[in-house]
Structure formats: structure tokens, C-alpha cells
């Protein structure tokens, strides 16, 4: 089982849409795949895929999940808020027929505030 996640870095404006993609590949067929998205280490959702369908369509606040055969799991955040900024990781595990798991690399999401003055204040608050 292998998981490739993208993009590595995503910068979007508050109120717009962010799309995170996870490609899950397995050399042999699987009956049930457990998937998980985390943000800053906290679980956003942990549905499974069987018979070509996701058991859950929502994933965290304003998050929509979709599965596109053969291998693409997409997390769409819409509308994006400042709270969505963080480090996202996609994880997958084949539960049937045999347990095998893998996770992607981090996608770092940066959300720019709609108000440019907020943006200036935020940049000014960085140390150094």
C-alpha cells in the first residue's frame, strides 16, 4: 500500500476553496479501505471505502470528502476559514483482506485573511 499526498504547500485566501488530494495505490484488490485525514495531529474524519463508496461525505468543518476510482481521495474545504490553516496528513489502511497501512507526507495549508490589514498584522507578529 502506498499513499501520495499533494500539494506539499497550499496558500489560499479566506472564503475561497482548498483542495487536498491523496492518491492511494495497492498492487492487489481490496475490499475495504479505512482512510483518515488529520489536521495538526487531530483526526478530522475516519471513514471507510467499500463497494466504491465512502461511508462518510463530511470531513471536519466545511470539509467534503470524495473518492474517485481508481485511487483518488479528495478533501475539499469550502469556504476556507483562518482556522483551516495547519498541517494535513492523509492516512490509509486496507482492512480487508489483510491489514496494511501507509500515510502521505504533510500538506501545509496557509489561509490569508480577506482583510489585507489583518495580513499585515499577522506578518508583523512573526518573531525575528
Amino acid at each position: 500500500l502506498s499513499v501520495q499526498q499533494g500539494p506539499n504547500l497550499l496558500q489560499v485566501r479566506q472564503g475561497s476553496q482548498a483542495t487536498l488530494v491523496c492518491q492511494v495505490d495497492q498492487a492487489t484488490a481490496w475490499e475495504r479501505l479505512r482512510v483518515k485525514w488529520t489536521k495538526d495531529g487531530a483526526i478530522l474524519c475516519q471513514p471507510y471505502i467499500t463497494n466504491g463508496s465512502l461511508s462518510l461525505g463530511v470531513c471536519g468543518p466545511q470539509g467534503r470528502l470524495s473518492w474517485q476510482a481508481p485511487s483518488h481521495l479528495t478533501l475539499q474545504l469550502d469556504p476556507v476559514s483562518l482556522n483551516h490553516s495547519g498541517a494535513y496528513v492523509c492516512w490509509a489502511a486496507v482492512e480487508i483482506p489483510e491489514l496494511e497501512e501507509a500515510e502521505g507526507n504533510i500538506t501545509r495549508l496557509f489561509v490569508d485573511p480577506d482583510d489585507p490589514t489583518q495580513n499585515r498584522n499577522r506578518i508583523a507578529s512573526f518573531p525575528g
Epitope: 498492487a27 492487489t28 484488490a29 475490499e31 467499500t50 463497494n51 476510482a69 501507509a102
Partner: antibody, heavy 120, light 113 residues
Framework: QVQLQESGPGLVKPAQTLSLTCTVS??????????WSWIRQFPGKRLEWMGY???????SYNPSLKSRVTISRDTSKNQFSLKLTSVTAADTATYCC????????????WGQGTMVTVSS | DIVMTQSPDSLAVSLGERATINCKSS????????????LNWYQQKPGQSPKLLIY???TRLSGVPDRFSGSGSGTDFTLTISSLQAEDVADYYC?????????FGDGTKLEIK
């Protein structure tokens, strides 16, 4: 460019252990998503998958070989090996190593194969 | 184990004519999760290792001539060579990767008539 090369004795006595090594060049056997297999072809041309070791060191074997088979690896030498115990004349075959990936699940690179005869 | 049954065992076709090789699996190789058939076709010429032609039942590997095509789904699959060339003389094998153990068909020997 990935290349695989089998090595080992061409003659093994019945009841002994057949040991072969596959040396991989141009690619790391620890690369995520890749599987390293042993396949044999009998004199009558029939192909049999014996088992694989994956990028994390996990293994899967053909149940028909009844625990006679072990596949291991040496990442420092970028090699993986086959051991087949209690051989008989029926194990006489050409032994090939091959690789496949999760994303494209086919044997895309094969070694040239090495003929092993089991005979006293 | 999934049993792969190939037919015919051998086939003689005139140059320029169509060659058809069949492969039947003892259980379905189609997954609704991935919308894929877990079946590959290989060509093996004398003294060489097998070479992949077709994967996922119908996807031709880059560099393989377009006279080779794969079709079928579930349990019944076909490899077709639309216009046989002299260099196509070889043994052809189907192989599933639906589950372990991975198994091969017994092969079809293709010759020129």
C-alpha cells in the same frame, strides 16, 4: 534504469536448501510502494510466483510452497534473497527475480533468470 | 487460489492475420472500489524473460505496438494481435494480481502458419 541480476548455484542436491540472491542496481529496494518477487519457470514453461518482500520488509508467500520458502533482504547491499528448503527434482526450474509497484501492479523489470537443477 | 485458464495452448496464424488468445479466471478480477480489472498480459520470446504488454486488462504499456490490444472484464479476457508480424512469435501469458498468490495462465504458443 533498474536492473536485476540473480546469482547462486546451478545445481542443488535433493533435500538440501536452494539459495539465490537478486542484486538490484539503479534503484533502492527500500523505495516506498515497491515489491520484490521471486518467480520460477518450470521446464514445461509454466510460471509460478513464489512470493515477495516489500519496501518495508513485509513478506507474502505462495501457500503452495508450504512454508519451504523464505525471502529476505539486505538493504545495505540492495539485495533480496530466496531460500527454498527440502528441494526435490520438481523444484528444477529457471528462477527469476522481478519487481512491481503499488501504482502499476505488473512485473515491469525482470532479471535474466538462473537455471537451477535439483539432482544428486 | 485463483486459477487462470488460457486457450488455445498453441495457435498458428498467417502473417498479417488476426491472432486471438483467451484467458478465463476462476473468479472475477474486477474491483468496484477501483473500477479496475486486475489482469496483465506478458509476451515471452525464446531465451528471454517475460515482457509486459497489457495491464489492467486493456491498458497497453508505453512502447508496445498498437496492434496489441486487451479486452474483457470480470472473468473473461482476450489478447488480440490485429495483424501478426514475424517478431510476434512467442509465448503469451495472462496473470492476475487480484490477491495473493498471484497466478499465471499456462501460456499460449503463437506461431506463424
Amino acid at each position: 534504469q533498474v536492473q536485476l541480476q540473480e546469482s547462486g548455484p546451478g545445481l542443488v542436491k535433493p533435500a538440501q536448501t536452494l539459495s539465490l540472491t537478486c542484486t538490484v542496481s539503479g534503484f533502492s529496494i527500500s523505495t516506498s510502494g515497491y515489491y520484490w518477487s521471486w518467480i520460477r519457470q518450470f521446464p514445461g514453461k509454466r510460471l509460478e510466483w513464489m512470493g515477495y518482500i516489500n519496501y518495508g520488509g513485509g513478506t507474502s508467500y505462495n501457500p503452495s510452497l508450504k512454508s519451504r520458502v523464505t525471502i529476505s533482504r539486505d538493504t545495505s547491499k540492495n539485495q533480496f534473497s530466496l531460500k527454498l528448503t527440502s528441494v526435490t527434482a520438481a523444484d528444477t526450474a529457471t528462477y527469476c527475480c522481478a519487481t512491481m509497484a503499488d501504482r502499476f501492479a505488473f512485473f515491469d523489470v525482470w532479471g535474466q533468470g538462473t537455471m537451477v537443477t535439483v539432482s544428486s | 487460489d485463483i486459477v487462470m485458464t488460457q486457450s488455445p495452448d498453441s495457435l498458428a496464424v498467417s502473417l498479417g492475420e488476426r491472432a486471438t488468445i483467451n484467458c478465463k479466471s476462476s473468479q472475477s478480477l474486477f474491483s468496484s472500489n477501483t473500477n479496475r480489472n486486475y489482469l496483465n498480459w506478458y509476451q515471452q520470446k525464446p531465451g528471454q524473460s517475460p515482457k509486459l504488454l497489457i495491464y489492467h486488462a486493456s491498458t497497453r504499456l508505453s512502447g508496445v505496438p498498437d496492434r496489441f490490444s486487451g479486452s474483457g472484464s470480470g472473468t473473461d479476457f482476450t489478447l488480440t494481435i490485429s495483424s501478426l508480424q514475424a517478431e510476434d512469435v512467442a509465448d503469451y501469458y495472462c496473470q492476475h494480481h487480484y490477491e495473493t498468490p498471484l497466478t499465471f495462465g499456462d501460456g499460449t504458443k503463437l506461431e506463424i502458419k
